[in-house]
Amino acid sequence: VPGEAEQPAPELVEVEVGSTALLKCGLSQSQGNLSHVDWFSVHKEKRTLIFRVRQGQGQSEPGEYEQRLSLQDRGATLALTQVTPQDERIFLCQGKRPRSQEYRIQLRVYKAPEEPNIQVNPLGIPVNSKEPEEVATCVGRNGYPIPQVIWYKNGRPLKEEKNRVHIQSSQTVESSGLYTLQSILKAQLVKEDKDAQFYCELNYRLPSGNHMKESREVTVPVFYPTEKVWLEVEPVGMLKEGDRVEIRCLADGNPPPHFSISKGNPSTREAEEETTNDNGVLVLEPARKEHSGRYECQAWNLDTMISLLSEPQELLVNYVSDVRVSPAAPERQEGSSLTLTCEAESSQDLEFQWLREETDQVLERGPVLQLHDLKREAGGGYRCVASVPSIPGLNRTQLVKLAIFGPPWMAFKERKVWVKENMVLNLSCEASGHPRPTISWNVNGTASEGDQDPQRVLSTLNVLVTPELLETGVECTASNDLGKNTSILFLELVNLTTLTPDSNTTTGLSTSTASPHTRANSTSTERKLPEPESRG
């Protein structure tokens, strides 16, 4: 109509899928009576009557909106429930009196896509590919309208780049009218991309504004040939015999090449291949000094039949040889002197020390131990320890027994044993001397003798307690080429008043004699050994 004003832009109403859209008829009272309104939907420029308002009462027209429309706000607003993407169109209300006017509303529908699902190319990408290869696929399901996708590498957005980066996106419409977006990132990767983190981001709009959702980060397997091969040894630092040592071959290629580890044979100048475990690791357990030498790793790239060699690695397994002491079995007269010398070989500087076996007392720091004016008590064990101070735990020891010539010494001079008549008693008698003594008993019984060490002997006698034995007691006699000595065991009958122990007796009804508190020798002068020599 000439002179008629241009049609105003429709009012915009934004709503999320599934919610209710409130379509407020914006006609003023002068433009029409809101108690008499027709509502239309416009789709592809075709208008369809969907709702009538008469005298303030609403009535749906048959069709797709029949069940979802209702009047609100005293008839001025039409409520559309369960909004779908198909509802994105223009709705208009038309007043009937005083003259026909219409008010247009553009309904915009939104739906956030689901979390983007990213799938990395499981086959991986070789770095030498001539064109961009598929890195990952991003899928954003059930969004409306179509979301925008942005790809990121290490937190930076990726742009299309000829022959380097290509992003291929497509979308499908679900029966619900929602869109599923699929985006494929193709790229030419380099070796440094082996640790690169890729993710996709979906940008979408809701009535509340712009939003985005990010996928998880993924890394793509990147394949590149090995350029460098090297060996690593664990543990790092000084190695010693007995350690568990792992020699591992490493390469900078992916996938790792086939490895072999070889040890140089100094006599043949050939590298002899060692047996590795399934992971290509050579395990030396326990490590021995023979494992020392030059190791190298060979790696084969089976794609090209190119073989690569590592730099050789020198392995040193530190050791201490068997310790030798001279003289090996020393024998000396009382009052004489003795020099003990200790020797050993090692891959490192050695420290020696001499210890008394019985007490662990350090007697000398150094390989030579000198003993003067030897007494009977000096007999026994001396231990040489050869150690490498720079490597804790690397040491070897050798024990030598010194024998001092002399008549037998008895473990005790006399002792009281509590007994019951007619019991079988187990008596023991201990003596030492050099040459080693033998022990005899003055009563009949079953005797057995055992060596405690080269200079010491223990004899055990099983005997029946008789009245005669109670009267005489029992004697044991130790003898060697240099003399003899005797110990006496007094037998006492047990009664309730004799159960209190004293320092020179053995208590209880045990069939074995307890160890002595003192040692005595029954020659004319009685000597007591120093406490450390006690066998208590």
Partner: antibody, heavy 120, light 112 residues
């Protein structure tokens, strides 16, 4: 019959670039490892580059690493050598070679070679 | 890198006589597991590309006459032509493939 025909050689100034090609026939090109070997005038042989059958693995000696790139197009039965930052010492006859099916690296078949001269 | 040294640099031998070329490696080329040496020999006649003669140090390539024999192990290798023929005039190269690939400098064989 296995045939390897090199092309692309010529005169180039120091610092310049050149791309050599090798057309292969008489065998299934995509199944074989290929290499380039060169020979300076009056001198011995020097290995230059190797590429796996699928093209994913490449190897070079230190003398050309970072300057030369070996590639292949299996659809075209062709092998290439892109040579950049050329030097006078790169002057040589360049041979295209094919490996054989042995478990060892050998150059079983050779082309006739193409001459590359680097000179100002 | 492995250095390959050939000796002599050149060799003049009468027809029908034996020719011996030596090749020495700066390190062993023997793979002790498979007991094979990563060494090959090539022949290059004047104006022609090289030709593979021997691989694994002693395995003759098919079609190569049996007068050509490769021997040796570890670091010392030999190519022997038992009875030199006129067509054997060429430069002979050894090549290692134990660590990347390197050729010897070549030995020229001529007729005396």
């Amino acid at each position: 019959e296995v045939q390897l025909v090199e092309s692309g050689g010529g005169l180039v100034q120091p610092g310049g670039s050149l791309r050599l090609s090798c057309a292969a026939s008489g065998f299934t090109f995509s199944s074989y490892i290929m290499s380039w070997v060169r020979q300076a005038p009056g001198k011995g042989l020097e290995w230059v580059a190797t590429i796996s059958s699928g093209g994913s693995s490449t190897y070079y000696p230190d003398s050309v690493k970072g300057r030369f790139t070996i590639s292949r197009d299996n659809a075209k039965n062709s092998l290439y050598l892109q040579m950049n930052s050329l030097r006078a010492e790169d002057t040589a006859v360049y041979y295209c070679t094919r490996d054989d099916d042995y478990d060892v690296k050998v150059f079983a078949y050779w082309g006739q070679g193409t001459m590359v001269t680097v000179s100002s | 890198d492995i250095v390959m040294t050939q000796s002599p640099d050149s060799l003049a031998v009468s027809l029908g006589e034996r020719a011996t070329i030596n090749c020495k490696s700066s390190r062993s080329l023997l793979n002790s597991r498979i007991r094979k040496n990563y060494l090959a020999w090539y022949q290059q006649k004047p104006g022609q590309p090289p030709k593979l003669l021997i691989y694994w140090a002693s395995t003759r390539e098919s079609g190569v006459p049996d007068r050509f024999t490769g021997s040796g192990s570890g670091t010392d290798f030999t190519l022997t032509i038992s009875s030199l023929q006129a067509e054997d005039v060429a430069v002979y190269y050894c090549k290692q493939s134990y660590n990347l690939l390197t050729f010897g400098q070549g030995t020229k064989v001529e007729i005396k």
